[in-house]
Interface confidence: medium
Amino acid sequence: HRRLDKIEDERNLHEDFVFMKTIQRCNTGERSLSLLNCEEIKSQFEGFVKDIMLNKEETKKENSFEMQKGDQNPQIAAHVISEASSKTTSVLQWAEKGYYTMSNNLVTLENGKQLTVKRQGLYYIYAQVTFCSNREASSQAPFIASLCLKSPGRFERILLRAANTHSSAKPCGQQSIHLGGVFELQPGASVFVNVTDPSQVSHGTGFTSFGLLKL
Amino acid sequence: HRRLDKIEDERNLHEDFVFMKTIQRCNTGERSLSLLNCEEIKSQFEGFVKDIMLNKEETKKENSFEMQKGDQNPQIAAHVISEASSKTTSVLQWAEKGYYTMSNNLVTLENGKQLTVKRQGLYYIYAQVTFCSNREASSQAPFIASLCLKSPGRFERILLRAANTHSSAKPCGQQSIHLGGVFELQPGASVFVNVTDPSQVSHGTGFTSFGLLKL
Amino acid sequence: HRRLDKIEDERNLHEDFVFMKTIQRCNTGERSLSLLNCEEIKSQFEGFVKDIMLNKEETKKENSFEMQKGDQNPQIAAHVISEASSKTTSVLQWAEKGYYTMSNNLVTLENGKQLTVKRQGLYYIYAQVTFCSNREASSQAPFIASLCLKSPGRFERILLRAANTHSSAKPCGQQSIHLGGVFELQPGASVFVNVTDPSQVSHGTGFTSFGLLKL
């Protein structure tokens, strides 16, 4: 901060801080003060400090969702869009395309298949999968979508699953599944979506997506 | 603020602000101060300011969800309830009825059809649609619910969609669709829900709803 | 707070608070001040207070999701897992097992059937139910899952419902329902999930869950 250079005369410090000591005494409940009422003093000073803080919040750029409550607590959120894949894996592929969200580098899409977070905390994680299947052309087993977690040094685990029996509609019947829940993630944890048959997934606009938000 | 009218005598300003200049010097790291240790000064003053701020947060009425972190960052959330409509449009109609939520005027329900936000930011937006349809009585195409975005000066965009093939149950078979995702909205942006056949939508308590919350 | 005991000399209070009165006047727009420019005074003081507040935010422990924005605003979230029950009630049973979440004692699972909150506010509440049913073996009525609210001194009410017609698959066809919405809860309010036939609910890992998060 720039110094108040226009002030040249400095009084003895033991006088200067009587101001603070007095407020301090007000705050700790001492009532030996004359002339000024403690509540008056405190309310005036509190009012001013609150004005400052209000002003501090007003000057935050409202058009940025990256930073919230200071650099210490940025918003962390992602929403990615399904991508058709020639891979035979049951793990769905995603892309940062269309109307996607990637708030900052505290959440990343890795290898097009998993959302990885850098900060520990509670996250609401969700996935939506639309698929088209036919009972006769599919296996007996239902179509299952699973939201899975891989934390560093730990085995994968299923967080959420949904199951829908195949439709009798021809050539196939479309159905949509939505999964969502609150989970604690460790730094470096990744979440991904598994389905029983990726070839049945619908990739038209908005049909299949995956995301999270940090509480 | 009310002025401290009980104080009538004013000293020369060059004296009054030595207080602040001294704290300032403490803050900028100057160590030419006698009598009082900077850390002591700063810690006392910080403690008091923090008490004020803590007190500021404590005195917020906890039964009000309107304001959060000062007027600059109020909670923004809405949950509206479906309304049957004689309109032929595919856009669903909503109402602030039943157990609805409308946190403040930073989100509004416009023309009974769209939720409009005043602040830019990340929002979790969701919709739930329950419908009753029959394969024979409906078109070949599935029932599709779309969550759409209209930003000022832009075309509408589909954010999310879900599709369910019609049931073979008679007279009709009920099914529920849930959509939800995180999206950045611009000031003045509106979100609304489109369905292929609004006449098939179920409007019983809790079956069809629409909402959002700002992260 | 410890008093500034090193300060022994106390000046007349009418002098001590000229400092605050002057800043106050600056703040209220009075421009009768000489020597020092109000903007300079205010900006110096604001800067220091903001530094304090920044420092306050920096010292928050990042690895704890329990406390957010001070003790006044802890994170409140829960995610519980379905539990098979021999009870004949239509209310689903839940447990803190598997990868569950229970942020703190401001939300609790009571009697294994309801999530109860201690603080008033806006909550995003969700439930997912997977069930397996057959049209011939079930009643005509669809399978319905309801998210219900019980507030102290008030009747229960339905917040959200979803309905799915039974499958024609044999022995039964699986389907998943997801419910979610933003609602204001009062202190002591409880939310629970009702289904038409609990015996049809699937309790495999991740299939059926229930949770909430406070905005």
Epitope: G204 | E156, F192 | -
Partner: antibody, heavy 118, light 107 residues
Framework: EVKLVESGGGLVKPGGSLKLSCTTS????????MSWVRQTPEKRLEWVAS???????YYFDSVRGRFTISRDNARNILYLQMSSLRSEDTAMYYC?????????????WGQGTSVTVS | DIQMTQSPASLSASVGETVTITCRAS??????LAWYQQKQGRSPQLLVY???TLAEGVPSRFSGSGSGTQFSLKINSLQPEDFGSYYC?????????FGTGTKLELK
């Protein structure tokens, strides 16, 4: 097969009116945004107006207040009501469907109907 | 309004050659750019949207690239049916605007 067929064009005097129609088939009309685009005699393409699946309307500045775009979802027809016509409105008018992906590019166009203001 | 500047205005090439047409937007349009082909006496046909995604049925010799303000359409190994006019169009906001067109002629 997706089909768009324009009609209603012709010769009209300045200040006159004309109503163009675009009859569609082969797709679920009410799920799509639709537009009118014109091509001037100099072969320049100009967007004229659009209507979303939710019935929101958008207009090119030079036609706003004079032209009205509308749709009849029951009959799968798109309309363009043109009034206060000017010589600079002379063009081939195409109706087009907006592509159903994250894009509002136009994937199907009609064969066009000619409008001459003279 | 966003202006779309297309170049060149005309281009002569032979069958089998590779050609590139460029389009510049007056401000960023991210990836919201489409390319159309129009043959004499016909209506425009969508080739590419979102700057690089080929529309259904479009041969793989066509490719789009670019983002922000600079875009290009490349046609590898020109075929006789590729001759005609090409237009770029942004689909970022209203008003939608088109480039002035590039006439691709047989040399």
């Amino acid at each position: 097969e997706v089909k768009l067929v324009e009609s209603g064009g012709g010769l009209v005097k300045p200040g006159g009116s004309l109503k163009l129609s675009c009859t569609t088939s082969g797709f679920t009309f009410n799920n799509y945004a639709m537009s009118w685009v014109r091509q001037t005699p100099e072969k320049r393409l100009e967007w004229v107006a659009s209507i979303s699946s939710g019935d929101s309307t958008y207009y090119f500045d030079s036609v706003r207040g004079r032209f009205t775009i509308s749709r009849d979802n029951a009959r799968n027809i798109l309309y363009l009501q043109m009034s206060s016509l000017r010589s600079e409105d002379t063009a081939m008018y195409y109706c087009a469907r907006h592509y159903d992906y994250d894009s509002y590019a136009m994937d199907y166009w009609g064969q066009g109907t000619s409008v001459t203001v003279s | 309004d966003i202006q779309m500047t297309q170049s060149p205005a005309s281009l002569s090439a032979s069958v089998g050659e590779t050609v590139t047409i460029t389009c510049r937007a007056s401000e960023t349009i991210y990836s919201y750019l489409a390319w159309y082909q129009q043959k004499q006496g016909r209506s425009p046909q969508l080739l590419v949207y979102n700057a690089k995604t080929l529309a259904e049925g479009v041969p793989s010799r066509f490719s789009g690239s670019g983002s922000g303000t600079q875009f290009s359409l490349k046609i590898n190994s020109l075929q006789p049916e590729d001759f005609g006019s090409y237009y770029c169009q942004h689909h970022y906001n209203t008003p939608l605007t088109f480039g002035t067109g590039t006439k691709l002629e047989l040399k």
